[in-house]
């Protein structure tokens, strides 16, 4: 029997997500495969031998192999879950455990900017924890959270790359700054 | 349960390359970048670049530039750091380490590190 | 490249000690500094992040503060298990750098 410590797995708000179980092949040896949410020590979905698989909900999908999708992500279903698997014998042959986390996936950046005083703003509207990196002609300028403003002393004229991301998703925008020698909007 | 497995050493020849292996498992591997670091022997650490299995995107400290190239290979799980044209300095111990992609500059777990030994 | 500066590069302690480990910043980095610890044949492990925030599994013997450019990680009863050298590092910009390290031995 292998129990080990939770798998951490993060899933993107309204989206899909398969809970696949590693080093676990499918065998005619296998009688019973059980999905629980440990909040409430309810059993998800279950595959059992010779009858019907169990979900206990439509946005629960349970494969061949063990894997169990959720599907179209909300906040509720971050928790701790936990796959039980038996062989025909009624041995507990495997176990694992998935602490499944949920972040909003990040939105575009936003990139404007001012020539009169050669401000630039990059800003992310959505997503849970995003981290903004910001890019002047490929070479990386400074990172931060949500919002990066940047005071260019240089040329007039470059390019800009900001890059927002979580552990979810990433987005990138890229603008190509010029402004004249006077500095106008 | 964060493990990032790498091989305890590489023996090479000067002038040669080596590829570095890091094996990830126990959480989301497009969810953090995976950082290098080298340490030579009683010496501190320094950082030689990452990448984001998420898209391949890569950042590399200027002075390894033209030594390394980070790759992925996201069906394994594995990220590689190729060091090429190696001299005696290149004798260190090279870490990987995963850093969270919103919060991307702590280098949160690491591996056991892969001794380089560049001797003729 | 953003020089970071450890000071004392060696500190000896006796177990119980309250010890203060200091690092600066060539230039302003806000919070983004993050402490490392190294035991003798191990890999480093995070011990504090953004200057003053934990780490799950790090004993709450260790803590972290300062802003801008000076920082200092405090470990306040120090055990003999705490024996390694300590490195800040810059999560500013880039490439990230490391301090040279101190040296926490016992006395």
């Known amino acids: 029997k292998e129990i080990t410590n939770a798998l951490e797995t993060w899933g993107a708000l309204g989206q899909d997500i398969n809970l696949d179980i590693p080093s676990f092949q499918m065998s005619d040896d296998i009688d019973d495969i059980k999905w629980e949410k440990t909040s409430d020590k309810k059993k998800i979905a279950q595959f059992r031998k010779e009858k019907e698989t169990f979900k206990e909900k439509d946005t629960y999908k349970l494969f061949k192999n063990g894997t169990l999708k959720i599907k179209h992500l909300k906040t509720d279903d971050q928790d701790i879950y936990k796959v039980s698997i038996y062989d025909t014998k009624g041995k507990n042959v495997l176990e694992k455990i998935f602490d499944l986390k949920i972040q909003e996936r990040v939105s575009k950046p936003k990139i404007s900017w001012t020539c009169i005083n050669t401000t630039l703003t990059c800003e992310v509207m959505n997503g849970t924890d995003p981290e903004l990196n910001l890019y002047q002609d490929g070479k990386h300028l400074k990172l931060s959270q949500r919002v990066i403003t940047h005071k260019w002393t240089t040329s007039l004229s470059a390019k800009f790359k900001c890059t927002a991301g979580n552990k979810v998703s990433k987005e990138s925008s890229v603008e190509p700054v010029s402004c004249p020698e006077k500095g106008l909007d | 349960q964060v493990q990032l497995q790498q091989p305890g050493t590489e023996l090479v020849r000067p002038g040669s390359s080596v590829k570095l292996s890091c094996k990830a498992s126990?959480?989301?591997?497009?969810?953090?970048?995976v950082n290098w670091v080298k340490q030579r022997p009683d010496q501190g650490l320094e950082w030689i670049g990452r990448?984001?299995?998420?898209?391949?995107?890569?950042h590399y400290n200027q002075k390894f530039t033209d030594k390394a190239i980070s790759t992925i290979d996201t069906s394994s799980n594995t990220a590689y750091m190729q060091l090429s044209t190696l001299t005696s300095d290149a004798s260190a111990v090279y870490y990987c380490?995963?850093?969270?992609?919103?919060?991307?500059?702590?280098?949160?777990?690491w591996g056991q590190g892969t001794l380089v030994t560049v001797s003729s | 490249d953003i020089v970071m500066t450890q000071s004392p590069a060696t500190l000896s302690v006796t177990p119980g000690d309250r010890v203060s480990l200091s690092c600066r910043a060539s230039?302003?980095?806000?919070?983004?500094l993050h402490w490392y610890q190294q035991k003798s044949h191990e890999s480093p492990r995070l011990l504090i992040k953004?200057?003053?925030q934990s780490i799950s599994g790090i004993p709450s013997r260790f803590s972290g503060s300062g802003s801008g450019s000076d920082f200092t990680l405090s470990i306040n009863s120090v055990e003999p298990e705490d024996v390694g050298v300590y490195y800040c590092?810059?999560?500013?910009?880039?490439?990230?750098?490391f301090g040279a390290g101190t040296k926490l031995e016992l006395r």
């Open positions: 590092q810059n999560g500013h910009s880039f490439p990230l750098t």
């Open positions: 953004y200057a003053s």
């Open positions: 380490s995963r850093s969270p992609r919103d919060s991307s500059t702590n280098l949160a777990d």
């Open positions: 990448i984001d299995p998420y898209d391949s995107e890569t």
């Open positions: 126990g959480y989301t591997f497009t969810s953090y970048w």
């Open positions: 230039q302003s980095i806000s919070d983004y």
